[in-house]
Interface confidence: low
């Protein structure tokens, strides 16, 4: 269990031409607020799906009146965060919806009524218990920027919120096969109490005895990926024991897509593809206009200014659809190389590379010990990428061609001379002096500061370094 | 349990009136751009007539342009459509939409004959 958290730091216009008019005026006065919906990471952005994950609104900000004449600046926000309680794990993957609404606080019949300003779409990666995330959306004219966390409740810790946590019992360590809580050093964290056998990366539970599965996993222990790949029809509710989806009737069966939209089945649902000027789950809403802010994710509205004419939405890179409500996964393409592990974030896309690659697609093989070789008895290392040798006794250089002076480096203190040695170098120490590198002085009354010469060396004999 | 319930249909000569009313509950009825659509025997549904979730945008199809004026009440969670002038192709189910970012409600539609 834990807390999503938004803070919204602005709202304001965005960058560029076209500033928005105000939404409010002096015969309208009205207040902002603000509506944050939560869905697992695998889930549809559509906005008609549930908000899977939970939903918060916000308190009402301060009355605003536009200055005549004057543009719209960022208007006056509500305080406090936005916090959405989750009571499962925490999924790691998450989809946002955020909306700004319009309180109209004018002469109205039946109190204040409200309208939709904006509304931003996303898609992130963040894991419970770390720092504030910032981020920046647009929506038409309008811009948002705003930071968002998952912190875990206590008992629970980590990424996922699903690791338990307990005062110590004994106050210097955790019993036995028990780790301290980080960040909470002085507990201790819970013996886990779930089903025998439960997945410990795809699986948790809240009471003992029970291993509820995260989303995408399935099965008694949550060992079983849901996967359609091995089965015979993509249909029907999902087999706790295999994965499979077993047939049944198809979710497009009676085309339950509107006004002449295509149904096409997902591992889900379906999915409907309107015809312009239609959009919803079921392509059911039409006569939309511009005004109406049809477009998803910051897409750009075109034409459309009466009912009768379609818009059209130019979507921002990542994002597709009538309305630009569909993330394109630009993963699906594969485009890193070598192995290389493909992460779409929202706004750019990185591969993280398999060790002796790099580059912006994983493109370029680092691994220059292939067919080079070390002279005089060096190995190649491979480390960070680059190629480098270890060099056997003596010797040195990128390839260890080079005869190493072991003297380059004055290792004798005490102006002590150096001689090169096929084992290594010899210091010949100065009178006063003794040591492998000169460095112990020898005391007047012959007394080294060793406590005693090794056996058949006087003080002032030069010393072999081996 | 979400609701929308058309009433105010019924058999009327051309060139008559009729006034047809749409009782919301269940939901946030104010936050929701309500729309009045309508289905001919034997066609596609067409959409009649919408109105912002304030009331101070309203749309109307060709169709229906000069005479029908859709409006609301959001104190009462009620929409209307006072509907002109009626000619014989107006006859059809008409049903009430409420739509929003996150979710479309229908109602079951009430039946408006116009004949002589």
């Known amino acids: 269990a834990g807390v999503f958290e938004l803070q919204i730091h602005s709202f304001g216009p965005g960058p560029g031409p076209g500033a928005p008019r105000s939404p409010c005026s002096a015969r309208l006065p009205c207040r902002l607020f603000f509506r944050v919906c939560l869905k697992p990471g695998l889930s549809e952005e559509a906005a008609e799906s549930p908000c899977a994950l939970g939903a918060a609104l916000s308190a009402r900000g301060p009355v605003y009146t536009e200055q005549p004449g004057a543009p719209a600046p960022d208007l006056p926000l509500p305080d406090g965060l936005l916090q959405v309680p989750f009571r499962d794990a925490w999924p790691g993957t998450f989809s946002f919806i955020i909306e700004t609404w319009r309180e109209e606080l004018g002469d109205q019949i039946g109190g204040p009524a409200w309208s939709l300003l904006a509304r931003v779409a996303g898609r992130r990666r963040l894991a419970a218990g770390g720092p504030w995330a910032r981020d920046i959306q647009r929506a038409g004219a309008w811009e948002l920027r705003f930071s968002y966390r998952a912190r875990c409740e206590p008992p629970a810790v980590g990424t996922a919120c699903t690791r338990l946590c307990r005062p110590r019992s004994a106050p210097s360590r955790c019993g036995p096969g028990l780790r301290p809580c980080a960040p909470l050093e002085d507990e201790c964290e819970a013996p886990l109490v779930c089903r025998a056998g439960c997945s410990p990366e795809h699986g948790f539970c809240e009471q003992p005895g029970e291993c509820r599965c995260l989303e995408g996993w399935t099965g008694p222990l949550c060992t079983v990926p849901v996967s359609t790949s091995s089965c015979l029809s993509p249909r029907g509710p999902s087999s706790a024991t295999t994965g499979c989806l077993v047939p049944g009737p198809g979710p497009c069966d009676g085309n339950p897509c509107a006004n002449g939209g295509s149904c096409s089945e997902t591992p889900r649902s379906f999915e409907c593809t309107c015809p312009r000027g239609f959009y919803g789950l079921r392509c059911e809403v039409s006569g939309v206009t511009c005004a109406d802010g049809p477009c998803f994710n910051g897409g750009l509205c075109v034409g459309g200014a009466d009912p009768d004419s379609a818009y059209i939405c130019h979507c921002p890179p990542g994002f597709q659809g009538s309305n630009c409500e569909k993330r394109v996964d630009r993963c699906s393409l594969q485009p890193c190389r070598n192995g290389g592990l493909c992460l779409d974030l929202g706004h750019a896309l990185r591969c993280r590379c398999r060790a002796g690659f790099a580059g912006p697609r994983c493109e370029h093989d680092l691994d220059d010990c292939a067919g080079r070789a070390c002279a005089n008895g060096g190995t190649c290392v491979e480390g960070g990428g680059a190629h480098r040798c270890s060099c056997a006794l003596g010797f040195g250089g990128r390839d260890c061609r080079e005869r190493a002076d072991p003297c380059a480096a004055r290792p004798c203190a005490h102006g002590g001379r150096c001689y090169a040695h096929f084992s290594g170098l010899v210091c010949a120490c100065a009178p006063g002096y003794m040591g492998a590198r000169c460095e112990f002085p020898v005391h007047p009354d012959g007394a080294s500061a060793l406590p005693a010469a090794p056996p058949g060396l006087r003080p002032g004999d030069p010393q072999r370094y081996l | 349990q979400v609701q929308l319930v058309e009433s105010g249909g019924g058999l009327v000569q051309p060139g008559g009136s009729l006034r047809l009313s749409c009782a919301a509950s269940?939901?946030?009825?104010?936050?929701?751009?309500v729309n009045w659509y309508r289905q001919a025997p034997g066609q596609e549904r067409e959409k009649v007539a919408r109105?912002?979730?304030?009331?101070?945008?309203?749309n109307y199809a060709n169709s229906a342009k000069g005479r029908f004026t859709i409006s609301r009440d959001n104190s009462k969670n009620t929409l209307y459509l006072q509907m002109n002038s009626l000619r014989a192709e107006d006859t059809a189910v008409y049903y009430c939409?409420?739509?929003?970012?996150?979710?479309?409600?229908w109602g079951q539609g009430t039946l408006v004959t116009v004949s002589s």
């Open positions: 939409a409420a739509e929003r970012f996150d979710s479309n409600y």
């Open positions: 269940g939901f946030d009825f104010s936050t929701y751009t």
């Open positions: 109105i912002s979730s304030t009331g101070t945008t309203t």
